[in-house]
């Protein structure tokens, strides 16, 4: 099985606001899992609508 | 493809100022740190600081901390190295870099001398 | 984190086969790269991730881990491959680099 994310590395521990820091595999890039009632890129605002 | 483009080679006085640019191609900045590296003449490499582009949040290397300034304009996708009080320890070449997992990316350098 | 490249320079021979060291003093799973410097010019990027070789870098390249361990390989040492190694691990901050491995010719 392929996973298509990776932890991020220790330098990324503060790249997503409220959410857990993914980095996915085939972009090369980190990314943000955002925490229930956060939105955006860095899971930075709230989610106004949960 | 991306591509880091460095700022041209600067011959400067001790005590100025100067500010080297890296244009990010291929890349939106915004999508992960972007880091300065300097390389002394026959000497190793040396982390300066890094950048997050969407915040403007930064993080230097002790040693650094008041010598380097780290800023980035997301709207040229462009980060910038900046120093003050310049001496001849400064003379180098800065390198800007974003580094991936499975791959990497650096920029061509910017040779910076200091003399009068 | 610190990275320790155990020689500082290396005597090979043209074909021979060469290992290029490099322990770190924490565990930076795999956020690992290589690096080969030529006198003059910027470090060229080999391998990150520990095992990925970099688009256009001969296949004769190779990086392997093992722990805290990490290992640059060179199947047949070419005239061109003659140049200083570093390592680098981008697991925390601050990036930290190895002293370097200088290849010099018997």
């Known amino acids: 099985v392929v996973s298509h994310f990776n932890d991020c590395p220790d330098s990324h521990t503060q790249f997503c606001f409220h959410g857990t820091c993914r980095f996915l595999v085939q972009e090369d890039k980190p990314a943000c899992v955002c925490h229930s009632g956060y939105v955006g890129a860095r899971c930075e605002h709230a989610d106004l609508l949960a | 493809e991306v591509q880091l483009q460095q700022s041209g080679a600067e011959l400067v006085r001790p005590g100025a100022s100067v500010k080297l640019s890296c244009t990010v191609s291929?890349?939106?900045?915004?999508?992960?740190?972007m880091h300065w590296v300097k390389q002394r003449p026959e000497q190793g490499l040396e982390w300066i600081g890094r950048i997050d582009p969407a915040n403007g949040h930064t993080k230097y290397a002790p040693k650094f901390q008041d010598k380097a300034t780290i800023t980035a304009d997301t709207s040229s996708n462009t980060a910038y190295l900046q120093f003050s009080s310049l001496t001849s320890e400064d003379t180098a070449v800065y390198y800007c870099?974003?580094?991936?997992?499975?791959?990497?990316?650096w920029g061509q350098g910017t040779t910076l001398t200091v003399s009068s | 984190i610190q990275m320790t490249q155990s020689s500082s320079s290396l005597s090979v021979s043209l074909g021979d086969r060469v290992t290029i060291t490099c322990k770190a003093s924490e565990h930076i799973n795999s956020w690992l790269a290589w690096y080969q410097q030529k006198p003059g010019n910027a470090p060229r990027l080999l391998i990150s991730?520990?095992?990925n070789l970099k688009t256009g870098v001969p296949s004769r390249f190779s990086g392997s881990a093992s722990g805290k361990d990490y290992t640059l390989n060179i199947t047949s040492l070419q005239t061109e491959d003659v140049a200083t190694y570093y390592c680098?691990?981008?697991?925390?901050?601050?990036?930290?680099f190895g002293g370097g491995t200088k290849l010099e010719i018997k």
């Open positions: 870099t974003r580094m991936g997992l499975r791959r990497g990316y």
């Open positions: 291929g890349f939106n900045i915004k999508d992960d740190y």
């Open positions: 680098q691990q981008y697991w925390g901050t601050p990036w930290t």
């Open positions: 991730g520990a095992t």
